[in-house]
Interface confidence: medium
Amino acid sequence: AGVFELQIHSFGPGPGPGAPRSPCSARLPCRLFFRVCLKPGLSEEAAESPCALGAALSARGPVYTEQPGAPAPDLPLPDGLLQVPFRDAWPGTFSFIIETWREELGDQIGGPAWSLLARVAGRRRLAAGGPWARDIQRAGAWELRFSYRARCEPPAVGTACTRLCRPRSAPSRCGPGLRPCAPLEDECEAPLVCRAGCSPEHGFCEQPGECRCLEGWTGPLCTVPVSTSSCLSPRGPSSATTGCLVPGPGPCDGNPCANGGSCSETPRSFECTCPRGFYGLRCEVSGVTCADGPCFNGGLCVGGADPDSAYICHCPPGFQGSNCEKRVDRCSLQPCRNGGLCLDLGHALRCRCRAGFAGPRCEHDLDDCAGRACANGGTCVEGGGAHRCSCALGFGGRDCRERADPCAARPCAHGGRCYAHFSGLVCACAPGYMGARCEFPVHPDGASALPAAPPGLRPGDPQRYL
């Protein structure tokens, strides 16, 4: 267990041209506050994914009113550190999001209004117990300077806060194989926490004497690989000898989530879904009310009359989630019909329609044939946002204006000669062949391969292609 600490040094205009306008004015005084969100690992996740390592809100800073005509200075900051307690091991690599929020204190009807001024994010490596790390991040024309560190809470020590320290039993030195606990030289490192023999690669522990297995491994010491075949119990395989998972105690047994949180298993551990008003790995941190500004992206917080009642965030269009933390991908609902391109402009949705379609959602199929005549007796056919002409015999082209040469495609088989005709084409067949396209051979005995020759035609006569 331990605490991640964040110290904001300054928030103000960054270097270079285009200094931002002050967020506060004489008409609209305001004050700043900050929110930090931590996630384990070098996560590329979106800003709205859960703050699995924890989150914290700062206090409000002093009220600030801009001096007319003066450039935006560094803005007055809240006192104190932002502290994010973590219950389990410090992961060593983490992702952070730091948001700077403005609370407007003008004559707002219904209380103060909040708006997000800047959001910075990054991924860092950090050992617990190390010195403060300094950082500078830019968001648009704003610059945020801050320091951070992770420190273990006694009795935990080490770069991941997983080693435990105990007061020395003897004044002079620690027991066999145990080192002094830097920086607490008067304490000794506690014996190994995990069960003896627990696989260092495939097992881990959070309590002394236990051995919990990573996904894919089983057995009392996590040394048996799991085979998923021939295992029928609800938790999967059921005996260490066959390499099957034992339906032993799961991480959610006994529900480690406090304050009515619901527990769900994860490959390594568990995750708590906390009721509103509680947060932290085990929902152990309480007391979030509307006064803490839990609604982001301009959401309106409506709170109950007493601490037992939940608050609710009413989100502006384009945002959702219990704290308005998620941007709505309204285009994912595919509102644009007929293959239109969806554009989410934030304040509104727009559909860019394909040719032949119109309307706010491309729902209107324009009459492709309106005002488009097909020449030479052709008929117009609508479809797919473009018109086409079905041409009368002997004509072709987009509008049936071109006279077609029916012989151009050499339609007469077996050396037959093609003649253009007012109603199409005629094939004069070579000796030994017959049919509209000279496709049928004539048998030597005079019978044809056709079931019967059309009346009035002898084999070898030209066949008119109708």
Epitope: Q108, I109, G110, G260, S262, T273, C274, P275, R276, G277, L300, V302, G303, G304, A305, S309, A310, I312, H314, C315, P317, Q320, S322, V328
Partner: antibody, heavy 118, light 107 residues
Framework: QVQLQQPGAELVKPGASVKLSCKAS????????MHWVKQRPGQGLEWIGM????????NYNEKFKSKATLTVDKSSSTAYMELSSLTSEDSAVYYC???????????WGQGTSVTVSS | DIQMTQTTSSLSASLGDRVTISCSAS??????LNWYQQKPDGTVKLLIY???SLHSGVPARFSGSGSGTDYSLTISNLEPEDIAIYYC?????????FGGGTKLEIK
């Protein structure tokens, strides 16, 4: 499509309790708040309270705190409202309504008519 | 609690008319206002949310406007199926409150 099914009517005796149900279908039940609204004959609508199925959070209109208890059964996607110590004042139509993601009651049940009579 | 007042409890109009129903709040509600339609059979439907956003499937003849404490619902071209009671509802503060309703009838 989103549907909220409520039984048509309940007849109960004064002093008794009644548990009204609202079965949801066509959407992810655990992701949306469920509201309950009262309408007395010939009168307007009155908000009773709301419950979040995943979190179990509730928020009541102070006026109904000692009258109504909201619960859910996630396995059957059903919201419940229990009304206790019934009097003739509780004779009304009770609606359940889903709170949409933009804070409007976007889908309503048909309502259950509760008659309190001896 | 925030009081929502619909001063006109009933109004009569002809088919094709433009009808406006008004609603006022006892304090500013920053556009956090919805409109609902209740048909004679008791069915309730959302029409407008956040003062002026049209709910999906609602005909475009319905529109909403307003700010601060005063809001209105307009039906631009009255049709027979619009016979109903119309309610406004604020969600700026708990408890959510509804107006008393405006009953719309055809002349």
């Amino acid at each position: 499509q989103v549907q909220l099914q409520q039984p048509g009517a309940e007849l109960v005796k004064p002093g008794a309790s009644v548990k009204l149900s609202c079965k949801a279908s066509g959407y992810s039940f655990t992701s949306y708040w469920m509201h309950w609204v009262k309408q007395r004959p010939g009168q307007g609508l009155e908000w009773i309270g709301m419950i979040h199925p995943t979190l179990g959070d509730t928020n009541y209109n102070e006026k109904f705190k000692s009258k109504a208890t909201l619960t859910v059964d996630k396995s059957s996607s059903t919201a419940y409202m229990e009304l206790s110590s019934l009097t003739s004042e509780d004779s009304a139509v009770y609606y359940c309504a889903r709170l949409g993601s933009l804070s409007m009651m976007d889908y309503w049940g048909q309502g259950t008519s509760v008659t309190v009579s001896s | 609690d925030i009081q929502m007042t619909q001063t006109t409890s009933s109004l009569s109009a002809s088919l094709g008319d433009r009808v406006t129903i008004s609603c006022s709040a006892s304090q500013g509600i920053s556009n956090y206002l919805n409109w609902y339609q209740q048909k004679p059979d008791g069915t309730v439907k959302l029409l407008i949310y956040y003062t002026s956003s049209l709910h999906s499937g609602v005909p475009a003849r319905f529109s909403g406007s307003g700010s601060g404490t005063d809001y209105s619902l307009t039906i631009s071209n009255l049709e027979p199926e619009d016979i109903a009671i119309y309610y406004c509802q604020q969600y700026s503060k708990f408890p959510y409150t509804f107006g008393g309703g405006t009953k719309l009838e055809i002349k």
